[in-house]
C-alpha cells in the first residue's frame, strides 16, 4: 500500500510498534495457555503482556468474560472467544467508518488511520482544507465532508486543473445584450446604451430616458429620443442659462442711448392713429390760429396736427406725404389739398409754423413760406356766443375716410418748443413731463426700434397662381432683415397660421439646441424644426444683414453674405417645405419682432426682439405704420443710436 506523506506521517508511530508483530502472535499463544485453558491471576497476565497498560486494560475485562461465560474449566467456547478478543482494541472498531482507512490495535489502545480530509482520534472530524491557502483554489474553496472543491465566481469557468478560474466572455453570444452594445468585464459583462438611453434587461433593448420626469428643466421640458430640451418663457424675458436647464433674464449686450427729452412730444405713441394731444380752445374774442413748433422725423407719411371743428364743417390738417408737407383743408364743407416745400423727413430738427392771417393760411419751414393758401373765413367757429377750435396733435378726431384724401395718420415724429395760439398754457408740458411714453428719444437714427416687449403683424400673401401655368400655385418667402440687436435672443420675423401655429420663424438665439452649445446664432425654422443656422456677432454694435429665401425645394439662410449651415437632410427639408407650402395657402399673419402667446415648445425662440431692424419681405420694405397691429412701444421709423461707452 502506497501512502501519501500525510498518511505516512500519521503511521510513523504505529509502524514502529508493528515491528514486534511476531511477539504479538507469541503473546496470543501464551494468553491461551495461561488464561483461557486455566484461570490466571493478574500477575500471570502481566507476564503474558509484559507491560502494565495492556495488563490494566485486559484484566478487568477478563474477569468480566468469566462472569459472563463461566470459568475456563467450564469449557464454554464463548469464554475463549471473549478472552481472545480482549487484546484487539479494534474489535469492535472504535474508529469512524466514513473517515477511517484502518484501525490499528495498540497495547490497551487503538489508532485510527484517517482517510484524506478527515482527522481526530476516531477520524470523525472533517479537515477544512480551505483554511490554508484557500485549498489552492484561485477563487472559491468549498469545504466538504472529507474533501473540498474549488469553484469560480459567476462569469468565470473552472479550468481543467480544477483550481484555476478563467473569465467567460459573455459578449461572444450576440443575444446577451440584444440591441444594446455588449462590453465584457472581468467575471461579468455590461449592456451599454447611448447617452439618454437606459438598458432594459427584460426587453434586452435600449430605452429612451424621459429626463423630463427627473425635473431637469426649470421651466418647460421636452423629451426626445436620447435627449431632452429645456425651454424658457421667452415672452417673459427669459432664455436658457449656459447649463441648458435653468433660465436667466435676457439682458442687453449692446447699450442703446434710450434717453428721453422731457421737453419733447412724441407723436407716434398711439398706433390706432388717434391723437396724442387734444386741445380745446374757446374764446369770447375772435382769435386766429397760430401753430408753431420744432419737428423731427424719418417717417414719410402721417398727421402732424388737426385744427378746426366737425369733419363736415371747417378744418385743416397738416400732414406729411412722401416726406413733404401736405395741407388738407375743408372750409364750409369744401375740401382742398396743397402740397409743397422741401422733403423734411431727414431726421433733423426744423421749425414749422401755420399762421392764420386775414384771408390766408401761411405755412413756413424754418421761417421760409412754403405754402400760402387763400381761405374764406376763420378756423374758429362761433357757437352760442363763443369761438371754438379743436386742435389735435399726431392724429385727427374723425375717420381717415372723412379727409379730403385719405392718409395714414400714424406719424413717428417728434415735436418740441410748441406754441399753440400764442398759448402759455403749461398743461401739455406738465402732462408730457409726467409720462415718459409721451416723450421722444433725445437722439434718433433711421430704422425701427423694437424695445423687447411687443410685436407688429401684417396680413401678407406669399402664394400666387401663375397664369401661364394655369392653376399651379407658386410660393416664395424672401426676407431681408437689417438688424442692430441689443440682445442675443429674439424673434426677427415669423409666419403664424391658424391656431397660432408658428409656420416659419427667423430668430436670434444664443445656443445650439441639439449640440447643447452656447453660441450666437440666427436660426431659420419651420415650426419647431431648425432648417438652418448661421453664426452672428450679435453683440458687436454693428448692423448685420440676415437674408432668408424659401421656395419649393430650397431654404437658405445668410448672415452678412455668408450662407448658413443646413440642419436637416434633403428629405426632411422637402417634407418641411411641403408642409409650409400647404399652410401658406391658409390664413397667415407675418409677425415682426415677436410672437403671439404661443407654446414655448412650438418654435425655437419665443422672446421679443430688442434692437433696430428694417425688414424687406418679397422685395417690399415693411412700413410699421401700415401694419395690421403694432405695439405702441415700437417706433416705426426711428431708432435710438448705440451708446458708445468710452473707457
Amino acid at each position: 500500500v502506497l501512502l501519501r506523506a500525510r498518511e505516512a506521517a500519521q503511521f510513523l508511530r504505529p509502524r514502529q510498534r508493528r515491528a514486534y508483530q511476531v511477539f504479538e502472535e507469541a503473546k496470543q499463544g501464551h494468553l491461551e495457555r495461561e488464561c483461557v485453558e486455566e484461570v490466571c491471576s493478574k500477575e500471570e497476565a502481566r507476564e503474558v503482556f509484559e507491560n502494565d497498560p495492556e495488563t490494566d486494560y485486559f484484566y478487568p475485562r477478563y474477569q468480566e468474560c468469566m462472569r459472563k461465560y463461566g470459568r475456563p474449566e467450564d469449557k464454554n467456547p464463548n469464554f475463549a472467544t471473549c478472552v481472545k478478543n480482549l487484546p484487539d482494541q479494534c474489535t469492535p472498531n472504535p474508529c469512524d467508518k466514513k473517515g477511517t482507512q484502518l484501525c490499528q490495535d495498540l497495547m490497551g489502545n487503538f489508532f485510527c488511520l484517517c482517510k484524506d480530509g478527515w482527522g481526530g482520534r476516531l477520524c470523525d472530524k472533517d479537515v477544512n482544507e480551505c483554511s490554508q491557502k484557500n485549498g489552492g483554489c484561485s477563487q472559491v474553496c468549498h469545504n466538504k465532508p472529507g474533501s473540498f472543491q474549488c469553484a469560480c465566481h459567476s462569469g468565470f469557468s473552472l479550468q481543467s486543473d480544477n483550481k484555476s478560474c478563467q473569465d467567460i466572455d459573455e459578449c461572444t453570444d450576440s443575444d446577451t445584450c440584444g440591441d444594446a452594445r455588449c462590453k465584457n468585464l472581468p467575471g461579468s459583462y455590461s449592456c451599454l446604451c447611448d447617452k439618454g438611453y437606459t438598458y432594459s434587461s427584460k426587453e434586452k433593448t435600449c430605452q429612451d430616458v424621459d429626463e423630463c420626469q427627473q425635473d431637469r428643466c426649470e421651466q418647460t421640458c421636452v423629451n426626445s429620443p436620447g435627449s431632452y430640451t429645456c425651454h424658457c418663457n421667452g415672452r417673459g424675458g427669459l432664455k436658457l442659462s449656459p447649463d441648458m436647464d435653468t433660465c436667466e433674464d435676457i439682458l442687453p449686450c449692446v447699450p442703446f442711448s434710450m434717453a428721453k427729452s422731457v421737453k419733447s412730444l412724441y407723436l407716434g405713441r398711439m398706433f390706432s392713429g388717434t391723437p396724442v394731444i387734444r386741445l380745446r380752445f374757446k374764446r369770447l374774442q375772435p382769435t386766429r390760429l397760430l401753430a408753431e413748433f420744432d419737428f423731427r422725423t424719418f417717417d414719410p407719411e402721417g398727421v402732424l396736427f388737426f385744427a378746426g371743428g366737425r369733419s363736415d364743417s371747417t378744418w385743416i390738417v397738416l400732414g406729411l406725404r412722401a416726406g413733404r408737407l401736405e395741407l388738407q383743408l375743408r372750409y364750409n364743407g369744401v375740401g382742398r389739398i396743397t402740397s409743397s416745400g422741401p422733403t423734411i423727413n431727414h431726421g433733423m430738427w426744423q421749425t414749422i409754423s401755420v399762421e392764420e392771417l386775414d384771408r390766408n393760411l401761411v405755412i413756413k419751414v424754418n421761417k421760409d413760406a412754403v405754402m400760402k393758401i387763400a381761405v374764406a373765413g376763420g378756423l374758429f367757429q362761433l357757437e352760442r356766443g363763443l369761438y371754438h377750435l379743436n386742435l389735435t396733435v399726431g392724429g385727427i378726431p374723425f375717420k381717415e375716410s372723412d379727409l379730403v384724401q385719405p392718409i395714414n395718420p400714424r406719424l413717428d415724429g417728434c415735436m418740441r418748443s410748441w406754441n399753440w395760439l400764442n398759448g402759455e398754457d403749461s398743461a401739455i408740458q406738465e402732462t408730457v413731463k409726467a409720462n415718459t411714453k409721451m416723450q421722444c428719444f433725445s437722439v434718433t437714427e433711421r430704422g425701427s426700434f423694437f424695445p423687447g416687449n411687443g410685436f407688429a403683424f401684417y396680413s401678407l400673401n406669399y402664394t400666387r397662381t401663375s397664369l401661364d401655368v394655369g392653376t399651379e400655385t407658386t410660393w416664395e418667402v424672401e426676407v431681408v432683415a437689417r438688424i442692430r440687436p441689443a440682445t442675443d435672443t429674439g424673434v426677427l420675423m415669423a409666419l403664424v397660421g391658424d391656431k397660432d401655429v408658428v409656420l416659419l420663424s427667423v430668430a436670434l438665439v444664443d445656443y445650439h439646441s441639439t449640440k447643447k452649445l452656447k453660441k450666437q446664432l440666427v436660426v431659420l425654422a419651420v415650426e419647431n424644426v431648425a432648417l438652418a443656422l448661421m453664426e452672428i456677432k450679435v453683440c458687436d454694435s454693428q448692423e448685420h444683414t440676415v437674408t432668408v429665401s424659401l421656395r419649393d425645394g430650397e431654404a437658405t439662410l445668410e448672415v452678412d453674405g455668408t450662407k448658413g449651415q443646413s440642419e436637416v437632410s434633403t428629405a426632411q427639408l422637402q417634407e418641411r417645405l411641403d408642409l409650409l407650402k400647404t399652410r401658406l395657402q391658409g390664413s397667415v399673419l407675418t409677425f415682426v419682432g415677436g410672437l403671439p402667446d404661443v407654446q414655448v415648445t412650438s418654435t425655437p425662440v419665443t422672446a421679443f426682439y430688442r434692437g433696430c431692424m428694417t425688414l424687406e419681405v418679397n422685395g417690399k420694405t415693411l412700413d410699421l405704420d401700415t401694419a395690421s397691429y403694432k405695439h405702441s412701444d415700437i417706433t416705426s421709423h426711428s431708432c435710438p443710436p448705440v451708446e458708445h461707452v468710452t473707457a
Epitope: R280, F281, K282, L284, Q285, T287, G385, L386, H388
Partner: antibody, heavy 116, light 107 residues
Framework: QIQLVQSGPELKKPGETVKISCRAS????????MNWVKQAPGKGLKWMGW????????TYTEEFKGRFAFSLETSATTAYLQINDLKNEDTATYFC?????????WGQGTLITVSA | ETTVTQSPASLSVATGEKVTIRCITS??????MNWYQQKPGEPPKLLIS???TLRPGVPSRFSSSGYGTDFVFTIENTLSEDVADYYC?????????FGAGTKLELK
C-alpha cells in the same frame, strides 16, 4: 409768468363813480379778451361781461348794462371797469379774468365798499 | 340763458371723507363744465376745465364727471386744506353762468 394786477380797495359814497384797473403782463395783451366778475360779500360769483382787447368793444350781461363801463389802455396793457352812480348793492369784490372761454388767470380782486 | 343749480349750499365732512357736489344745467351743455375752488380773500382757482380735464398741478383727489345737464364734482379723502367755497361754471354759451357755490367745512 402771466399776471393780472388790480388796483386797491375803494370806499365810496352812493352816487359816486369808481374806476378799477387791471394791468396784464406775461402775454400778448391783445390776443385775449378781458372778463369782469362780481362777488358780493358772502355771495357767489357773477359774470359781468368782457371787452375785446383788439377792438375795444365791450359786451355786458343784462344785469350790468347801463352804469357799468369796460375800457382799455392797450399801450399800458390795462383794462378798466368803471361804475357810475354807485349803489349800496355795488359793494363787492370785482375780479378781472383773462378770456380763455373759461377763466384760468384772475386778478387778485378789488373790494369796492359803497357806504353813506 | 343757461341757469346752473348747485347743491348742496354747504356741507360739513370729517378729514378723509368723500365730498360730492352736484350742478344741474337748464340746457344741454355737452361737457362744457368747469369747477373752481375759492379760499377767503383769494380769487377763484380753476381745478377742472371742460371735458372733465384736471388742470396741471391739481391733486388727483379732485375729479369730475358728467355730460349734458348733470355734473358731479368729487373730492376723495378730504384734507383740511380743502376747506373752501366751490363753484361750477358753464362755458357752453353766453352769458357764462356760475353755480351759487358750495361751502365746505370740516367737522
Amino acid at each position: 409768468q402771466i399776471q393780472l394786477v388790480q388796483s386797491g380797495p375803494e370806499l365810496k359814497k352812493p352816487g359816486e363813480t369808481v374806476k378799477i384797473s387791471c394791468r396784464a403782463s406775461g402775454y400778448t395783451f391783445t390776443n385775449y379778451g378781458m372778463n369782469w366778475v362780481k362777488q358780493a360779500p358772502g355771495k357767489g360769483l357773477k359774470w359781468m361781461g368782457w371787452i375785446n382787447t383788439n377792438t375795444g368793444e365791450p359786451t355786458y350781461t343784462e344785469e350790468f348794462k347801463g352804469r357799468f363801463a369796460f375800457s382799455l389802455e392797450t399801450s399800458a396793457t390795462t383794462a378798466y371797469l368803471q361804475i357810475n352812480d354807485l349803489k349800496n348793492e355795488d359793494t363787492a369784490t370785482y375780479f378781472c379774468a383773462r378770456d380763455e372761454g373759461w377763466f384760468v388767470y384772475w386778478g387778485q380782486g378789488t373790494l369796492i365798499t359803497v357806504s353813506a | 340763458e343757461t341757469t346752473v343749480t348747485q347743491s348742496p349750499a354747504s356741507l360739513s365732512v370729517a378729514t378723509g371723507e368723500k365730498v360730492t357736489i352736484r350742478c344741474i344745467t337748464s340746457t344741454d351743455i355737452d361737457d362744457d363744465m368747469n369747477w373752481y375752488q375759492q379760499k377767503p380773500g383769494e380769487p377763484p382757482k380753476l381745478l377742472i376745465s371742460e371735458g372733465n380735464t384736471l388742470r396741471p398741478g391739481v391733486p388727483s383727489r379732485f375729479s369730475s364727471s358728467g355730460y349734458g345737464t348733470d355734473f358731479v364734482f368729487t373730492i376723495e379723502n378730504t384734507l383740511s386744506e380743502d376747506v373752501a367755497d366751490y363753484y361750477c361754471l358753464q362755458t357752453d354759451s353766453v352769458p357764462l353762468t356760475f353755480g351759487a357755490g358750495t361751502k365746505l367745512e370740516l367737522k
